[in-house]
C-alpha cells in the first residue's frame, strides 16, 4: 500500500513510496522537505501560506543557517522551517492511526539538522528504520540555531526562543495535519538528544503545548541542565551587536539594528571556543533558551505541573561529560598527559562559582576521596569525565524525573542509563559510552549500515528501538508490537529505578539509585551552602575569538567516512559534537 | 474575472449516483485546488473534499471515502463530484468552490447545485 | 477532525448595533476564516485568516483570535448584513462552524 498525494493544510504533498523488499509487501512511505512555517531574522515563526498543485517532497531541504564545524563560514539557509516524515506501509491497505515520533536534534543550540550528519545520502536521523522496525510515524524537523535561533535582549525587544518557537510550530504542524499521513494525532512521542532532549524537557514545560504531547523521551539533557538556560542574554545580544555594529545602549535600537543585519554576520559574530578558557566550555553557550515569560514563562523547575499527563523516558549515557571533559581538560584523553589535582580543581570551580570557595572545595573533596586509595592516572581521569557527566547530565536528570514523578497524575515515568561503550577506537580503554553515542543504536544504523558494526551493536540498537517506539505507542515501553529483553520498569522516587542499556539486557539490567552518593551531595550538602554575591552568569567571553574549531572526531556509524560529493551544503557534520 | 458555473438540478433516487460539474473560467485552471461542499435543506455547510486539477490529486472527508469520486476534464477546465450509493439524506446543494490562495479559505464559489434523492 | 463550535447559533440585534460571533476550534488551529451566506446564495468570503479583510468587503467588519478561540465583530450593523455566519478551519480536512443567523430584531 502507499499513500501518494497527501492533502495537507497546505496543500497537496506527494513523497516517495519506498519497497522494503524485492518482493514487494512491506514499503515505507517517505516525503521530505515539507514546509510547517516560515520566519523573517529574528522573529517569531508564523504560518506557512501554503501553495497551490502538489508539493513534490522528495529532498531534504538546506539545515537552517549556522556556522560550519570551521567557524569561519556558514552554511544552510534562513528559508528552513521544513520537516520530513516517514510512515511505514503494510501490504494491503495504508496505515491509519499510528503513534507519531517527533525528533528533535541536538547541537547545542548552536548546529544540527533534521536529517543529521550525512556520508554519501546516508543521514544520521533518516527514520525509515525506526519507523518500520516499531510501525511508528517518525518526524524529523530543522529549527533555527545560534544566535538566528536564540539571540535575546532579555526583554520584549528581542525575546528570543525563537527556535523553540520553531520547535512548537512543527509539533503544532504534526497535531493538525498528521491523520492525513495516517498518524494519530492524540498520540504523539517528541524525542530528542542533548540539546535537543532538553528543547523536548522545554516544549513539555511550555504552557504553549498544552494538549499537544502525549509522552517524551529526553536523551542527554534537560530543561534543568545548567546549558539549557541563559541567564545572562543581554550579556551575549550586546557582544553580538558590537561585532556586528549595532549600537548596544538601548535595547529597542539594538533589536532593530540585528533584525537587518547579515544573518550570515550574525551568525559568524558568535564562536564556541574549543580552546581551554577560564570557565568550562558549556559556560560559552551563549545562544540557548531563556526565561522569557511567555514561552517559557518561569524557571524550569516550577513548570512541572504541565507534564501532570505527559508519559517520559529519561536517561543519559555513562559518560556523557567525556566529551566535554576532553575540552576543559584536554589531558583526560591523552595517554601521555596526566591530569592533576590542580587541573580538577579548576574544573570544579568553574561549575560551582554560585557557592563560591564552600561549593568548590566540598566538591572537590567529595569527588576525589578515591584518589587516596588508587591515585592512578585512569582513576583520576575517570573522575574527571564522572564529575562532568554528573553535573551536565545526571544529577539534572534525576531531579528532573523526581520532579516530573511527584507531579504526575496520569503519566508514567521511566529512567535509563546507556552504557554499550563508544566504538572511538583513538579514546581510552576505560572509556563507557559518550555524549551521542546513543544515536546510532535509536536510529537503527547497525541495521541500516551492517558492515560497520557488530551483532551486539544490532541487539543494542533493536532493543533501544523496541522499547522506544512501544513507549511511543503504549506509554510503556515493554507493551506494543516488539518484543524486548527484559521488563523496564518505572522510575519511583524510593528506588531510583533505572534501566542500564548494554549489549546484554537481562533482569539484572534493571538497577537502583544511580551515583546516590553523589545525587545526595548535589540535592542536599551543596544545595545548602551560601550562595555567593556577585553575578556568576557574566562571563568574560574568549579574548581570542578568531581561533577556530578544531575537527571534531568523525562520526563512527558509517563505514564509508568520505564527505558527500552530492551536496555541500550537507558536508559531513559529525554527530558525536552536539549537545 | 475568476467563474465557475456548475451543472443544474438533479432529482436521483436512492442507490443511484450523480454526477455534477464545475466548469472554470477567468484564470489558469490547473492553479488552483477545487473543493466540493454541501449544504442540507436549512442546514451548514459540510465539506466533502478537494482536487488538485493539474495531476489529479484528491483528498475525501473521512465520511465520504468510497462513495465520492472527483475528477477533472483539463480540456474543458471542468471539475466534476460524483456520489453513488445516494440516500435521502444527500438532498443538499452541493458547491463548488476554489482556492483563494495557498492554504487559503475557499474564495470563490460556484451557483449550486441542488441535487434531491426520493424515492 | 476538528470541531467548530461557533456561538451564537441565532443572534437578534439591531442597524447600527455591534455584534460579536464567537468560534471555538477543538484544537489549535493555524487561521480561522469568515463567510457569509444570504438565503438561495453561495457562501461570500468575508475574513481570511483570522484577521484580513477579503478585498471589497466593508471595514466594520474584522476578526480576530489565536489558537482555538476567534471572533468575528460587526461594528456597526448595517440592514444587508442580515445573514447567516460561518467560520471555517482549513486543516487537512476542513470544516465548518454550524453557523450563525443574525436577524432583524
Known amino acids: 500500500a502507499k499513500l501518494g498525494a497527501v492533502y495537507t493544510e497546505g496543500g497537496f504533498v506527494e513523497g516517495v513510496n519506498k519497497k522494503l523488499s524485492l518482493l514487494g509487501g512491506d514499503s515505507v512511505d517517505i516525503f521530505k522537505g515539507i514546509p510547517f512555517a516560515t520566519a523573517k531574522t529574528l522573529e517569531n515563526p508564523q504560518r506557512h501560506p501554503g501553495w497551490q498543485g502538489t508539493l513534490k517532497a522528495t529532498n531534504f531541504k538546506k539545515r537552517c543557517l549556522q556556522a560550519t564545524i570551521t567557524q569561519d563560514n556558514t552554511y544552510g539557509q534562513e528559508d528552513c522551517l521544513y520537516l520530513n516524515i516517514w510512515v511505514p506501509q503494510g501490504r494491503k491497505q495504508v496505515s491509519h492511526n499510528l503513534p507519531v515520533m517527533v525528533w528533535i536534534y541536538g547541537g547545542a543550540f548552536l548546529m544540527g539538522s533534521g536529517q543529521g550528519a550525512n556520508f554519501l545520502k546516508n543521514y544520521l536521523y533518516d527514520g525509515e528504520e525506526i519507523a518500520t522496525r516499531g510501525n511508528v510515524i517518525v518526524v524529523t524537523f530543522n529549527y533555527r540555531v545560534g544566535p538566528l535561533g536564540f539571540l535575546s535582549t532579555g526583554d520584549a525587544n528581542l525575546p528570543g526562543n525563537f527556535g523553540l518557537r520553531d520547535q512548537h510550530m512543527a509539533i503544532a504542524w504534526v497535531k493538525r495535519n498528521i491523520a492525513a499521513f495516517g498518524g494519530d494525532p492524540d498520540n504523539i512521542t517528541i524525542f530528542g538528544e542533548s540539546a535537543g532532549a532538553a528543547s523536548v524537557s522545554l516544549q513539555t514545560l511550555s504552557p504553549y503545548n498544552k494538549g499537544l504531547i502525549r509522552r517524551a523521551i529526553s536523551q542527554s539533557g534537560m530543561a534543568l541542565s545548567p546549558w539549557a538556560i541563559q541567564k545572562n542574554p543581554l550579556f551575549w545580544a550586546k557582544t553580538i551587536a558590537k561585532k556586528v555594529g549595532c549600537p548596544t545602549e538601548d535595547t529597542g535600537k539594538m533589536a532593530a539594528c540585528l533584525k537587518i543585519t547579515d544573518p550570515r554576520a550574525l551568525t559568524l559574530a558568535y564562536k564556541l571556543p574549543v580552546k581551554k578558557q577560564e570557565y568550562p566550555v558549556v559556560h560559552y553557550l551563549a545562544f540557548i533558551p531563556v526565561i522569557d515569560g511567555d514561552f517559557i514563562p518561569d524557571d524550569p523547575i516550577n513548570l512541572y505541573n504541565n507534564t501532570a499527563d505527559i508519559d517520559y523516558i529519561a536517561g543519559i549515557n555513562n559518560m556523557d561529560g567525556h566529551l566535554f571533559a576532553t575540552i576543559d581538560v584536554p589531558a583526560v584523553d591523552k595517554t601521555k598527559q596526566t591530569v592533576t589535582e590542580e587541573d580538577f580543581y579548576r574544573l570544579v570551580s568553574g561549575h560551582t562559582v554560585a557557592k563560591g570557595l564552600k561549593g568548590a572545595q566540598a566538591t572537590f573533596d567529595i569527588y576525589t576521596e578515591s584518589w587516596a586509595q588508587d591515585p592512578s592516572q585512569e582513576n583520576m581521569k575517570k573522575t574527571v569525565v564522572a564529575f562532568e557527566t554528573d553535573v551536565l547530565f545526571l544529577i539534572p536528570t534525576e531531579i528532573a524525573l523526581a520532579q516530573h514523578k511527584a507531579h504526575a497524575k496520569s503519566a508514567k515515568t521511566y529512567s535509563y542509563l546507556f552504557s554499550h561503550p563508544s566504538r572511538m577506537p583513538i579514546y581510552p580503554k576505560w572509556m563507557g559510552a559518550d555524549h551521542a553515542d546513543d544515536l546510532q543504536y535509536v536510529f537503527g544504523k547497525p541495521f541500516a549500515t551492517p558492515l560497520g558494526y557488530r551483532p551486539q551493536d544490532r541487539a543494542v540498537s533493536k532493543a533501544m528501538i523496541a522499547y522506544w517506539t512501544n513507549f511511543a505507542r503504549s506509554g510503556d515501553p515493554n507493551m506494543g508490537n516488539s518484543p524486548v529483553p527484559t521488563h523496564w520498569y518505572p522510575y519511583t522516587l524510593e528506588n531510583g529505578n533505572y534501566l542500564d542499556i548494554t549489549k546484554t539486557i537481562t533482569s539484572a539490567s534493571m538497577k537502583e539509585h544511580l551515583r546516590e552518593k553523589f545525587l545526595k551531595f548535589w540535592a542536599v550538602t551543596f544545595e545548602v551552602l551560601p550562595t555567593v554575591t556577585g553575578d556568576q552568569d557574566t562571563l568574560t567571553p574568549p579574548e581570542d575569538d578568531s581561533e577556530v574549531a578544531p575537527d571534531p572526531p568523525s562520526d563512527d556509524s558509517q563505514v564509508v567516512p568520505v564527505p558527500p560529493t552530492d551536496d555541500s551544503v550537507e558536508a559531513q557534520m559529525p554527530a558525536t559534537i552536539g549537545f | 474575472q475568476v467563474q465557475l458555473v456548475q451543472s443544474g438540478a438533479e432529482v436521483k433516487k436512492p442507490g443511484a449516483s450523480v454526477k455534477v460539474s464545475c466548469k472554470a473560467s477567468?484564470?489558469?485552471?490547473?492553479?488552483?485546488?477545487m473543493h466540493w461542499v454541501r449544504q442540507a435543506p436549512g442546514q451548514g455547510l459540510e465539506w466533502i473534499g478537494v482536487i488538485n486539477p493539474g495531476d489529479g490529486a484528491t483528498s475525501y472527508a473521512q465520511k465520504f471515502q468510497g462513495r465520492v469520486t472527483m475528477t477533472r476534464d483539463t480540456s474543458t477546465s471542468t471539475v466534476y463530484m460524483e456520489l453513488s450509493s445516494l440516500r435521502s439524506e444527500d438532498t443538499a446543494v452541493y458547491y463548488c468552490?476554489?482556492?483563494?490562495?495557498?492554504?487559503?479559505?475557499?474564495?470563490?464559489w460556484g451557483q449550486g447545485t441542488l441535487v434531491t434523492v426520493s424515492s | 477532525d476538528i470541531q467548530m463550535t461557533q456561538s451564537p447559533s441565532s443572534l437578534s440585534a439591531s442597524v447600527g448595533d455591534r455584534v460579536t460571533i464567537t468560534c471555538r476550534a477543538s484544537s489549535s488551529i493555524s487561521y480561522m476564516h469568515w463567510y457569509q451566506q444570504k438565503p438561495g446564495k453561495a457562501p461570500k468570503l468575508l475574513i481570511y485568516a483570522a484577521s484580513s479583510l477579503q478585498s471589497g468587503v466593508p471595514s466594520r467588519f474584522s476578526g480576530s483570535g489565536s489558537g482555538t478561540d476567534f471572533t468575528l465583530t460587526i461594528s456597526s450593523l448595517q440592514p444587508e448584513d442580515f445573514a447567516t455566519y460561518y467560520c471555517h478551519q482549513r486543516s487537512s480536512s476542513p470544516t465548518f462552524g454550524q453557523g450563525t443567523k443574525l436577524e432583524i430584531k
Open positions: 468552490a476554489r482556492d483563494y490562495y495557498g492554504s487559503s479559505p475557499l474564495g470563490y
Open positions: 477567468g484564470y489558469t485552471f490547473t492553479s488552483y485546488n
